[in-house]
Amino acid sequence: FPQDRPFEDTCHGNPSHYYDKAVRRCCYRCPMGLFPTQQCPQRPTDCRKQCEPDYYLDEADRCTACVTCSRDDLVEKTPCAWNSSRVCECRPGMFCSTSAVNSCARCFFHSVCPAGMIVKFPGTAQKNTVCEPASPGVSPACASPENCKEPSSGTIPQAKPTPVSPATSSASTMPVRGGTRLAQEAASKLTRAPDSPSSVGRPSSDPGLSPTQPCPEGSGDCRKQCEPDYYLDEAGRCTACVSCSRDDLVEKTPCAWNSSRTCECRPGMICATSATNSCARCVPYPICAAETVTKPQDMAEKDTTFEAPPLGTQPDCNPTPENGEAPASTSPTQSLLVDSQASKTLPIPTSAPVALSSTGK
């Protein structure tokens, strides 16, 4: 169209511009390696770097990888865009206890209110459940919409505090009176858990619990269905089976519906520090001093805590194999399996001593 000629002419002789017939305008020509952010850029700021897929352009004009939400406790909240990262959040039923840039480092299951208490604030992706006492004349089972979505004959099972699944209540400021926190690095070194936190290390609702109808009251013949890699413990909670993924461990018994997987030290190793259903520390099988033989027992099965012998001696070595009996093994104290990344203290009942180990999840 001849009437377009004057507009087109204004671009000629200016190498930094070109004429776009579709919009009938002069457009700024983005330098090599930069790409227009709009159809007809007008100025250098309308040009930007083109990042590869799953990368975004950060504030410093660098192509930066978008976070991934591939962990199974995360879901995508906002997608990866040219100028912003993907954002992940904890999946429904979980909340973030340790946040990370555009994601969450640790998700925990929302806690179930203790029996008799009611939900004041249902958990979100960021916050744990908040519970409160029931008001007089209100049944705890139906005291709030969250607790009573539809009438049922049985009440929803409620969790008692147990040192099984650490979760974190969001109100976590600790008072000066002994507010112990487990440092991430120290978590694996503790042999005795701190007495109790103020608001961290909360018992969570059943992790891995597949939604099923609660059992009718008085019926003992139905059970919860747990997700894969979880088992139903004695208290009726779905609890994660321990993992034998450490390369010094092997699976002894598999994860079953009502019992955890058990791990033992691989052949040639002895358990130095036991843990429930596993071993927190395996050490190489001791070499016996000259003229001694090792007691004929499966050392991987020894489940007492190994104490270092006096200098110059070897553990479990006998001058002669007089009998095939293993030494008397005291049953280990109740162990508490904690993810070694957990930086939270856990509630410990005062009635039983508890060992803290970094083994398994």
């Epitope: 203790p114 008799g116 208490m117 744990n128 908040v130 006492p133 505090p161 969001s170």
Partner: antibody
Framework: QVTLKESGPGILQPSQTLSLTCSFS??????????VSWIRQPSGKDLEWLAH???????RYNPSLKSRLTISKDTSSNQVFLKITSVDTADTATYYC?????????????WGAGTTVTVSS | DIVMTQSQKFMSTSVGDRVSVTCKAS??????VAWYQQKPGQSPEALIY???YRYSGVPDRFTGSGSGTDFTLTISNVQSEDLAEYFC?????????FGSGTKLEIK
């Protein structure tokens, strides 16, 4: 370090309104699950829970005193207030504010030192 | 309201002994019970929550037990600094209510 400190008029006359202030530090009342309760203890008598305010401004009162109580907060200045109207000598007590920090269990983990209130004509 | 009864107003014990303070609820409060220690001239301090869970920093000679209506605070190996009044509190339903307290005297 978590601290709470109560302040009040010390002495007031029957039928007046008692105004108490709880000033705290070391935590924020905007944190989910957090709350502050008022409790009183007449000399040599039992502890009596009066009221609680949640982080979301939800309020709970002891039904036996509800008509006379008003609890409120100023999150930005880290203060919680309690007003008791129409006081009489039975309101003479040490008044404590205490924190509920645990979202699951309603125990009061840190208490203020208390302020003594005497209602006397 | 739920009444929390601490039938023993005073208990006498010696250093190194074991003593149990009891608390009875007028109705089922599940395990929604806390215990507090109040030393003379001081404000209460949390010891136990959820009937048996020791609050952080509390010495392990303090243990809690019970559920439903009967609760016990046990102090093993009593120390002179344990001279105090001990209160139970229920938080199963509003209003929160406290026991009348048990004063521990050291012989």
């Amino acid at each position: 370090q978590v601290t709470l400190k109560e302040s009040g008029p010390g002495i007031l006359q029957p039928s007046q309104t008692l105004s108490l202030t709880c000033s705290f530090s070391g935590f924020s009342l905007s944190t989910s699950g957090m709350g502050v309760s008022w409790i009183r203890q007449p000399s040599g008598k039992d502890l009596e829970w009066l009221a609680h305010i949640y982080w979301d401004d939800d309020k709970r009162y002891n039904p036996s005193l509800k008509s006379r109580l008003t609890i409120s907060k100023d999150t930005s200045s880290n203060q919680v207030f309690l007003k008791i109207t129409s006081v009489d000598t039975a309101d003479t007590a040490t008044y404590y504010c205490a924190r509920r920090a645990d979202g699951l269990y309603f125990y009061l983990d840190v208490w203020g030192a208390g302020t003594t209130v005497t209602v006397s004509s | 309201d739920i009444v929390m009864t601490q039938s023993q107003k005073f208990m006498s014990t010696s250093v190194g002994d074991r003593v149990s303070v009891t608390c009875k609820a007028s109705q089922n409060v599940n395990t929604n019970v806390a215990w507090y220690q109040q030393k003379p001239g001081q404000s209460p301090e949390a010891l136990i929550y959820s009937a048996s869970y020791r609050y952080s920093g509390v010495p392990d000679r303090f243990t809690g037990s019970g559920s439903g209506t009967d609760f016990t605070l046990t102090i093993s190996n009593v120390q002179s600094e344990d001279l105090a009044e001990y209160f139970c509190q229920q938080y199963n339903s509003y209003p929160l209510t406290f026991g009348s307290g048990t004063k521990l005297e050291i012989k």
